[in-house]
C-alpha cells in the first residue's frame, strides 16, 4: 500500500518546520526495476540524506533564515550506478517559527514636528526588521508608544501607526503642543512580532527625540495706511509666510466689498493696489489663506487688519444752505440764539476735523455792527450788545467762516426777530375724560385729539406748541404728534398696551413753546390737561423668551441626554404646557412642564445639522392659546463615518495585453466634517495577496493612484480591495473594492463579441 510517506519517484514538495530536531522520515521512494538504488543531489547543505533503499530524511534542525527552500533532485540508479529514472525535483519548503526578535534599525531617532501640524500626518518613521517570515505572524511587526516624556495631564500628543511605524500628532498634540512651553519630547517606542498579539512575542525598544518647532503661520501686526497715497501702487504693506515653501497664497474678502484694494503674491507679500479713502472706509479686515498645490487649505486663514490713516482732505460743510434761528425782541444779552453745527468728514476728534467759527459779516449793520457773537469752538450764537426791535429790523443775515486747520467754508445764518413770548398755550379742555381701549389696539393708532391755542405771533417759536406727557405713562406707551399749522395734538400708541401691568392710567399733558417765556410769565394750569386711559384685558398667547432657541451637542450623545430647554410665560399667568412639532426624525422629546428637551434616539450630524423643530407653548386652561418658537439643535461632528469611494467606479478597464504598467486615479470621501483642512485619508491595499500585482500611492488627502506592478494580467475582471483610513479619533477604516477589467480593445474601447453585453466597462486607462 503506497501511502503518505512512500511511493514511486516523482516530483514532490514537502514542508518542514525549522528548528525541529528530526523525528521521522520525509519519504520512502520505491524503486521500479531495473532501478535498485537512489541518489540525492542539489541544495542538501549536508542536512538532507537519501539511503540507497530510497529513504529520504534530514539529520539536523533546519533554519529558514539560512535557506527557506531547498531544491533537491532524486535519481534512481541501476546496479551499475547508471541513472534509469529521474532525476526529479524534490522541493523542501522550510516553514517559519518565531525564532528571531525584531530589531530597530537605530537605537535613537531624532525628528522635528511643527506646532499645530495636522493630526495623523507622519513626520517621522521608525523602522524595525525581523528575519522571520513577514507572511506569517512571526515576522509581522507591531509598533507602539511605551511612554511619552513629558506627559502633561495624562494626554498623549503623539501617536504611532502600529503597522508602518509612522509617528504623527494626535488631535490634542496638534492643538496643544507649544515650543514656548515645551520645546522637546522623548518617546520610547516598542516593536513586537506576532503582530503584537501573543504573550510569546519578541520585542525591542528605541528612543525618539522630538523637537517642536513654532508654527509661523501667524497673523501679522495690524498696519496703518495713509489715505490718498500718491506713491506708485501697488505698495507692499505686510506679509504672511507658510511654514514650508511652495504654498499658494490668496486673500479672502469676507465683507464682499465692491472694490477690494488688496492683493497677495506667491511669496506671501500683501499689497495695497490703489489709494484708499478713509471717508469711504476707515478700516479693512480680510483673510490670507495658504493652500497646497491641489488647492486644499493648509491651515486656518489669518486675519489681516489695515487701518486707514486720515489726512485733512475734507473742508467743513454747512448743515444747510441757510440756517434759520429766532430771537425774541426783548431777549437779554448773552442769551443763546442757537448753535450752528458744521460737519467735517475727516476723522473725529483730530485736528483734521476740529472746527473754528467766526462771524465775518452781519447785514444789516443796524442799529450797529457786532450785535451777535459766536463761540469759536462750539458754534453757539449769542446776543452780544442789546435787545433787538422787530419794527426796526425784523431779520439779520450772518456770514460765518467755519475752518479746520487747512480749509475755510462760509455758512449763512438767518436770524428772525420775533414777537416776545408773553402768552402761554391754553388747552381748550382741561379734562378729556375716559377712554377705554383693548390691550391689543394697534401700534400707531391715533386714540385722542387734543388742542391748545397760543395768542403769540403765528408760525414762530413763541406760538408753536409742543405737547408732552408728563405723568401717567412711565413706560412710554403713548406719544403726541403736533400738526405745525393747527397746533393740534394727536395722541398715538407707540408701544403695546398691557392690561396686566397698567389697567388704568391717569395721563397728564403739558403744552409748551420752543421759545422761552418772557421774564415774569409762567406756565399755569391752563397749559395742562388730563385724561384717563382704561385698558381692557385680551387673552393673550404665551410668549417665548426667544424667537429661536439654539443648543449644541455632540452627535454621539447617549439617548436620554438633555440637549436644551425652552421657556415661555403666559401674560395672564396661566400654566404652560410644552410640545414639539415637526420632529420628523423622531429624535427628541420635551418635558411638558419644564420645557427641557431630551434625545430619544441616536443623533446623526450627517443627516443634517442644525436639526430644526418647532416648540409649542400652550396655556393650560383658559382658551388654550398657543404660540410657536424654533429650536435649533446644532450637532457637533464625531468621527463615525468610514471613508468610501466618492463615486461609482464600475467600468474601469485596461486594454489587454498591457504594453506597460498602467494606473488610474480614484477619490475617497466620508460624511464627517472636515472644516478648513479637508479630509486626510491614507490608502493601502486591502489584502497582502494583492501586493504582487498592485500598488496604491497617495496623491493628496482625498485622491490616490492605483497602479499595476507588472503587465502579466489575465484577460478578466480583477476586484482590487483598497483600505482607506481617515486618521480620525477614533480612526475609521473603510475597505472598498475597485473592479478593474483587462479586456481586448478596439479603438481604445473594450471589445465584446455580439450578444455578450453584460458588464461592459466604460472607462479605459
Amino acid at each position: 500500500q503506497e501511502g503518505k510517506f512512500s511511493g514511486p519517484l516523482k516530483p514532490m514538495t514537502f514542508s518542514i518546520y525549522e528548528g525541529q530536531e528530526p523525528s521521522q522520515i520525509i519519504f520512502q521512494f520505491k524503486a521500479n526495476p531495473p532501478a535498485v538504488t537512489f541518489e540525492l543531489t542539489g541544495e542538501t547543505d549536508n542536512i538532507f540524506v537519501i539511503e540507497r533503499e530510497g529513504l529520504l530524511y534530514y539529520n539536523r534542525a533546519l533554519d529558514r533564515e539560512t535557506r527557506s527552500t531547498h531544491n533537491l533532485q532524486v535519481a534512481a540508479l541501476d546496479a551499475n550506478g547508471i541513472i534509469v529514472e529521474g532525476p526529479v525535483p524534490i522541493t523542501i519548503k522550510v516553514k517559519d517559527i518565531n525564532d528571531n526578535r525584531p530589531t530597530f534599525l537605530q537605537s535613537k531617532y531624532e525628528g522635528s514636528v511643527r506646532q499645530n501640524s495636522r493630526p495623523g500626518k507622519p513626520f517621522l518613521y521608525v523602522n524595525a526588521t525581523d528575519l522571520d517570515d513577514p507572511a506569517t505572524p512571526n515576522g509581522q511587526l507591531y509598533y507602539q508608544i511605551v511612554i511619552q516624556l513629558p506627559m502633561i495631564n495624562n494626554v498623549m500628543y503623539f501617536q504611532i501607526n502600529n503597522k508602518t511605524g509612522a509617528i504623527s500628532l494626535t488631535r490634542e498634540g496638534s492643538q496643544e503642543l507649544n515650543p514656548a512651553k515645551n520645546p522637546s519630547y522623548n518617546l520610547v517606542i516598542s516593536v513586537k512580532d506576532m503582530g503584537g498579539q501573543s504573550e510569546n512575542s519578541f520585542s525591542d525598544t528605541t528612543s525618539v527625540d522630538i523637537i517642536v518647532t513654532e508654527n509661523i503661520w501667524k497673523a501679522p501686526k495690524p498696519v496703518e495706511m495713509v489715505e490718498n497715497s500718491t506713491d506708485p501702487h501697488p505698495i507692499k504693506i505686510t506679509q504672511v509666510r507658510w511654514n514650508d515653501p511652495g504654498a499658494q497664497y490668496s486673500l479672502v474678502d469676507k465683507e464682499k466689498l465692491p472694490r477690494f484694494p488688496f492683493s497677495i503674491d506667491q511669496e506671501g507679500d500683501i499689497y495695497v493696489t490703489q489709494p484708499l479713502d478713509r471717508e469711504e472706509k476707515d478700516a479693512y479686515v480680510f483673510y490670507a489663506v495658504a493652500k497646497d498645490e491641489y488647492g486644499k487649505p493648509l491651515s486656518y486663514p489669518l486675519e489681516i487688519h489695515v487701518k486707514v490713516k486720515d489726512i485733512n482732505d475734507n473742508p467743513p460743510t454747512c448743515p444747510s444752505p441757510v440756517t434759520v434761528f429766532e430771537v425774541q425782541e426783548n431777549e437779554r444779552l448773552g442769551n443763546s440764539i442757537g448753535t450752528l453745527t458744521a460737519h467735517d468728514r475727516d476723522e473725529e476728534n483730530t485736528a483734521n476735523s476740529f472746527l473754528n467759527y467766526r462771524i465775518v459779516e452781519q447785514t444789516p449793520k443796524l442799529p450797529m455792527d457786532g450785535l451777535f457773537l459766536i463761540q469759536t469752538y462750539a458754534g453757539m450764537l449769542q446776543l452780544a450788545k442789546q435787545s433787538l426791535k422787530k419794527q426796526d429790523t425784523p431779520q439779520y443775515n450772518l456770514t460765518i467762516e467755519v475752518s479746520d486747520k487747512d480749509f475755510k467754508t462760509l455758512c449763512f445764518v438767518q436770524i428772525n426777530v420775533i414777537d416776545i413770548n408773553d402768552q402761554i398755550p391754553i388747552f381748550e379742555k382741561s379734562d378729556y375724560g375716559n377712554l377705554t381701549l383693548a390691550e391689543d389696539t394697534n401700534i400707531g393708532s391715533t386714540i385722542l385729539t387734543i388742542q391748545a391755542t397760543d395768542a403769540d405771533e403765528p408760525f414762530t417759536g413763541s406760538s408753536k406748541i409742543l405737547y408732552h406727557i408728563i405723568k401717567g405713562d412711565s413706560e412710554g406707551r403713548l406719544g403726541v404728534d403736533t400738526d405745525p399749522h393747527t397746533n393740534t395734538g394727536y395722541v398715538i400708541i407707540k408701544k403695546p398696551l398691557d392690561f396686566e401691568t397698567a389697567a388704568v392710567s391717569n395721563i397728564v399733558f403739558k403744552a409748551e413753546n420752543p421759545e422761552p417765556l418772557v421774564f415774569g410769565v409762567k406756565y399755569n394750569a391752563s397749559s395742562f390737561a388730563k385724561f384717563t386711559l382704561i385698558v381692557t384685558d385680551v387673552n393673550e398667547a404665551p410668549q417665548f423668551s426667544q424667537h429661536v432657541f439654539q443648543a449644541k451637542v455632540s452627535e454621539d450623545v447617549a439617548i436620554g441626554t438633555k440637549v436644551g430647554n425652552v421657556t415661555a410665560k403666559d401674560p395672564e399667568g396661566l400654566d404652560i404646557s410644552y410640545s414639539l412639532r415637526g420632529d420628523t426624525r423622531g429624535w427628541l422629546k420635551i418635558d411638558h412642564v419644564t420645557g427641557e428637551i431630551f434625545s430619544v434616539a441616536p443623533l446623526d450630524r450627517e443627516a443634517g445639522s442644525p436639526y430644526r423643530v418647532q416648540v409649542v407653548a400652550t396655556e393650560v386652561g383658559g382658551s388654550s392659546l398657543s404660540s410657536v418658537s424654533e429650536f435649533h439643535l446644532i450637532l457637533m461632528d464625531v468621527n463615525d463615518n468610514p471613508p468610501r469611494l466618492a463615486k461609482d467606479y464600475t467600468g474601469l478597464f485596461f486594454c489587454h495585453p498591457l504594453s506597460a504598467p498602467g494606473s488610474l486615479i480614484f477619490e475617497a470621501t466620508d460624511d464627517d466634517q472636515h472644516l478648513f483642512r479637508g479630509p486626510h485619508f491614507t490608502f493601502s491595499l486591502g489584502s497582502g495577496s494583492l501586493q504582487n500585482d498592485w500598488e496604491v500611492s497617495k496623491i493628496n488627502g482625498t485622491h490616490a493612484r492605483l497602479s499595476t506592478r507588472h503587465t502579466e494580467f489575465e484577460e478578466r475582471e480583477y476586484v482590487v480591495l483598497i483600505r482607506i483610513n481617515d486618521g480620525g479619533r477614533p480612526p475609521l477604516e473603510g475597505i472598498v473594492s475597485l473592479p478593474v477589467t483587462f479586456c481586448s480593445c478596439v479603438e481604445g474601447s473594450c471589445f465584446r463579441p455580439a450578444g455578450h453585453q453584460t458588464g461592459i466597462p466604460t472607462v479605459g486607462m
Epitope: E110, S112, P179, A180, P183, I211, T213, E214, I216, K218, P220, K221, P222, V223, E224, M225, V226, I237, T238, Q239, V240, R241, N243, D244, P245, G268
Partner: antibody, heavy 119, light 110 residues
Framework: QVQLVQSGAEVRKSGESLKISCEGS????????IAWVRQMPGKGLEWMGI????????RYSPSFQGQVTISADKSISTAYLQWNTLKASDTAMYFC????????????WGQGTLVTVSS | QPVLTQPPSASGSPGQSVTISCTGT?????????VSWYQHHPGKAPKLMIY???KRPSGVPDRFSASKSGNTASLTVSGLQADDEADYYC??????????FGGGTKLTVL
C-alpha cells in the same frame, strides 16, 4: 528712501542711566518692528530685542531681558534703547534696524551709536 | 557664545568662489526658512545680502547666493571682488520671538 538716524556717541560712568534714540523716515514707521543689535568691541552682532511702534508690543532676547528697556514714540517716528544702571560691560556699538514682521530679517540699519562706559 | 556656528575666517582670490557655512540646530536653522545673511564693513552699518534662506534684495549682485540643507545654511560669493572683503553674519529665527546671529566670518580677498 528708508533712513534710520541714530543719536550721537555717548560717554558715561558706571551706574549712570542712558537713553539713545533712533529716528525713522521714508516709510510708515508704525508698520515695521524696530530691532536693537549690539556689537561689543571685536565681537559679533547680538540681537537684543524688538518693538512694534504701532502698538508698542515689545519682545526681548532672553540675554537682555531686564537689562535694557526698549520703547518708541510713533508720533515722532522714534525708538529708544534705555539703561537705568550702566556697567562697563555695556560698552559697545548699538545699531537700530528695521525688522520685517512675520519674516525675521533686518532690511535697513542705522549708522550705530557708540556707547562707552568707564568704571 | 553664539548659537549659530560660522568659521571665523574664509578667503579666496579675485574671481574665485568662496562658501561660508552657518550651522545651527533643528530648533533654528533647520526648523524655519528664516535664515538671512549680512555684510558688515567695519565702521559702517551692516547690509542685508540674503533673506528667507535664498532670496536676494534688489541691488544685491547675483554673485551672492545662498541655500540651506538640514541644520546648515551656506552663503556663496562667486567672482570675488576686492569690495567683498568684509565680515559676514548669518542669522536665523529660533522660535519664541527670538533671532540668533552667527559669530561672523571674516572674508579676505587675497
Amino acid at each position: 528712501q528708508v533712513q534710520l538716524v541714530q543719536s550721537g556717541a555717548e560717554v558715561r560712568k558706571s551706574g549712570e542711566s542712558l537713553k539713545i534714540s533712533c529716528e525713522g523716515s521714508g516709510y510708515s514707521f508704525g508698520n515695521y518692528w524696530i530691532a536693537w543689535v549690539r556689537q561689543m568691541p571685536g565681537k559679533g552682532l547680538e540681537w537684543m530685542g524688538i518693538i512694534y511702534p504701532g502698538d508698542s508690543d515689545t519682545r526681548y532676547s532672553p540675554s537682555f531681558q531686564g537689562q535694557v528697556t526698549i520703547s518708541a514714540d510713533k508720533s515722532i517716528s522714534t525708538a529708544y534703547l534705555q539703561w537705568n544702571t550702566l556697567k562697563a560691560s555695556d560698552t559697545a556699538m548699538y545699531f537700530c534696524a528695521r525688522h520685517v514682521d512675520s519674516t525675521w530679517y533686518i532690511d535697513h540699519w542705522g549708522q550705530g551709536t557708540l556707547v562707552t562706559v568707564s568704571s | 557664545q553664539p548659537v549659530l556656528t560660522q568659521p571665523p575666517s574664509a578667503s579666496g582670490s579675485p574671481g574665485q568662489s568662496v562658501t561660508i557655512s552657518c550651522t545651527g540646530t533643528s530648533s533654528d536653522v533647520g526648523g524655519y526658512n528664516f535664515v538671512s545673511w549680512y555684510q558688515h564693513h567695519p565702521g559702517k552699518a551692516p547690509k542685508l545680502m540674503i533673506y528667507e534662506v535664498s532670496k536676494r534684495p534688489s541691488g544685491v549682485p547675483d554673485r551672492f547666493s545662498a541655500s540651506k540643507s538640514g541644520n546648515t545654511a551656506s552663503l556663496t560669493v562667486s567672482g570675488l571682488q576686492a569690495d567683498d572683503e568684509a565680515d559676514y553674519y548669518c542669522s536665523s529665527y529660533a522660535g519664541n520671538d527670538n533671532l540668533q546671529f552667527g559669530g561672523g566670518t571674516k572674508l579676505t580677498v587675497l
